[in-house]
Interface confidence: medium
């Protein structure tokens, strides 16, 4: 007997062909011998089956000896053996209908688990294999679980159900809710305006929730809430902001914060959390601020950085167009009795300059000028 696999909610067409290429009498019945549909002359007739309003044929092909049974909006319980009676012959087709659903929302927070559940007819023993958007394969039976979802798991998951050497394919769109970057670092000279951006890695029509930026300044003993805000249909409104520093926040996505001035006392690490409506858990993005200051006090030219720097970063002081006078993997470097000229303080990583501050050293009878 022929086996046909169908997908819940889809349409299936079961074929039945007569040897005579003309319209003759036919009937489709289920395994309980209940008539589903057939013909009476040129008219389609329907029986008392539960498929009544979802069953159809292809009237246009009857004249060619084709008498299909079309079942729309398939249900798991439509799985059955269907019998076509034509020309004193019986053609049997076994229909197996499967469904695959994500049994949580398809919008999941980074780090959460995804569970896919297969609905299958009694007596079937299907195997399921799913391929994630990043090419990872997972196999299972009635349920498949993926823990610790990552950003790269966003997209279309393709799942293949195998039964009787036949397959049916499901596609499920999964959206992993996360910020585009888990962490970012901003390098600024003292006094410069600081822009923090927190772009989301997903787009949804309506986005509602609330968020907060906690800040741990390097010089402070404890962290402090710098700003709290609400998000309603992608519109941002500030609820509370500290007086020092007085952050400003953009009214539209992506989430955008402005610190009027980079100062040593603000250097440190922040954690922006976003709690989305109807979701358990929060989105997180870490942000770091490194501040540089170059100063000349009497006969000492000093360059300092504050904030979370990696131990491999190099801090250097050099006279313009000359070799570095001093270069150390430390957070402060200095030169005693510096020559007159334009000095550069450089923070670099493997030769790539991350931050630069220039200071003009005047001959000893003058006071220094900071450009």
């Amino acid at each position: 007997k022929k086996v046909v696999l169908g997908k819940k909610g889809d349409t299936v067409e079961l074929t039945c062909t007569a040897s005579q290429k003309k319209s003759i009498q036919f009937h489709w019945k289920n395994s309980n011998q209940i008539k589903i549909l057939g013909n009476q002359g040129s008219f389609l007739t329907k029986g008392p089956s539960k498929l009544n309003d979802r069953a159809d044929s292809r009237r246009s092909l009857w004249d060619q000896g084709n008498f299909p049974l079309i079942i729309k909006n398939l249900k798991i319980e439509d799985s059955d053996t269907y019998i076509c009676e034509v020309e004193d012959q019986k053609e049997e087709v076994q229909l197996l209908v499967f469904g695959l659903t994500a049994n949580s929302d398809t919008h999941l927070l980074q780090g959460q688990s995804l569970t896919l559940t297969l609905e299958s007819p009694p007596g079937s023993s299907p195997s399921v294999q799913c391929r994630s958007p990043r090419g990872k394969n997972i196999q299972g039976g009635k349920t498949l679980s993926v823990s610790q979802l990552e950003l790269q798991d966003s997209g279309t998951w393709t799942c293949t159900v195998l039964q009787n050497q036949k397959k049916v394919e499901f596609k499920i769109d999964i959206v992993v809710l996360a910020f585009q970057k888990a962490s970012s670092i901003v390098y600024k000279k003292e006094g410069e305006q600081v822009e923090f951006s927190f772009p989301l890695a997903f787009t949804v029509e309506k986005l509602t929730g609330s968020g907060e930026l906690w800040w741990q300044a390097e010089r402070a003993s404890s962290s402090k809430s710098w700003i709290t805000f609400d998000l309603k249909n992608k519109e941002v409104s500030v609820k509370r902001v500290t007086q020092d520093p007085k952050l400003q926040m953009g009214k539209k996505l992506p989430l955008h914060l402005t610190l009027p001035q980079a100062l040593p006392q603000y250097a440190g690490s922040g954690n922006l959390t976003l709690a989305l409506e109807a979701k358990t858990g929060k989105l997180h993005q870490e942000v770091n601020l490194v501040v540089m200051r170059a100063t000349q006090l009497q006969k000492n030219l000093t360059c300092e950085v504050w904030g979370p720097t990696s131990p491999k970063l190099m801090l250097s002081l050099k006279l313009e167009n000359k070799e570095a006078k001093v270069s150390k993997r430390e957070k402060a470097v200095w030169v005693l009795n510096p020559e007159a000229g334009m000095w550069q303080c450089l923070l670099s990583d493997s030769g790539q300059v991350l931050l630069e501050s220039n200071i003009k050293v005047l001959p000893t009878w003058s006071t220094p000028v900071q450009p």
Epitope: V12, E13, T17, D56, E169
Partner: antibody
Framework: QVQLVQSGAEVKKPGASVKVSCKAS????????ISWVRQAPGQGLEWMGI????????SNAQKFQGRVTMTRDTSTSTVYMELSSLRSEDTAVYYC???????????WGQGTLVTVSS | DIQMTQSPSSLSASVGDRVTITCRAS??????LNWYQQKPGKAPKLLIY???TLESGVPSRFSGSGSGTDFTLTISSLQPEDFATYYC?????????FGGGTKVEIK
């Protein structure tokens, strides 16, 4: 929702053959039939034939008998329509459409322009 | 083959007008009649099947009626997006055949 994506435009010489593909996604490929319909420039719609889903049996309009071949590849969810012995009057946009039987063609490909010119 | 004849072949109407397009089959086709809308450079779109059943997602201003040989597509209040060409099609007997189309233009 079923999506049908067709191959790109073709330019052919009279007497040659053309093979147009129609790739299905978003549904169970083997569960529905595909009809092929063409439309000459500025003209109406003309049904060419249908390929049955599970068995791959076909039924063609008499006008195209012997010139049109419809095939399917279940592994790639693709249906093909090959038209041979092309003539200038075969210049048209060729569409594949999901055919739900007596409830009509409810999903169409974007169309493939075939130009037959010497 | 069953011939399908549509009338008129074109018509001019204004937004808000009630528009009626007719389709006649050369023999009885019961209710096996479908209506499609096609815009320039686009594939046809199913509007109505089995003479009077509205396809899901199609606005309720579209309606179909008829049985046997005479069928009608009605747009109760024409909207700017309705200016297009409309085709009827029979699914009673192969080869499936379409009407010649009715182009609905802005007056």
């Amino acid at each position: 929702q079923v999506q049908l994506v067709q191959s790109g435009a073709e330019v052919k010489k009279p007497g040659a053959s053309v093979k147009v593909s129609c790739k299905a996604s978003g549904g169970t490929f083997s569960s529905y039939a595909i009809s092929w319909v063409r439309q000459a420039p500025g003209q109406g719609l003309e049904w060419m034939g249908i390929i049955n889903p599970s068995g791959g049996s076909t039924s063609n309009a008499q006008k195209f008998q012997g010139r049109v071949t419809m095939t399917r590849d279940t592994s790639t969810s693709t249906v093909y329509m090959e038209l041979s012995s092309l003539r200038s009057e075969d210049t048209a946009v060729y569409y594949c459409a999901r055919d739900l039987g007596d409830t009509a063609m409810d999903g169409w490909g974007q169309g493939t322009l075939v130009t037959v010119s010497s | 083959d069953i011939q399908m004849t549509q009338s008129p072949s074109s018509l001019s109407a204004s937004v808000g007008d009630r528009v009626t397009i007719t389709c006649r089959a050369s023999q009885s086709i019961d209710s096996y009649l479908n209506w499609y809308q096609q815009k320039p450079g686009k594939a046809p779109k199913l509007l109505i099947y089995k003479a009077s059943t509205l396809e899901s997602g199609v606005p309720s201003r579209f309606s179909g009626s008829g049985s046997g040989t005479d069928f009608t597509l009605t747009i109760s209040s024409l909207q700017p997006e309705d200016f297009a060409t409309y085709y009827c099609q029979q699914s009673y007997s192969a080869p499936l055949t379409f009407g010649g189309g009715t182009k609905v233009e802005i007056k």
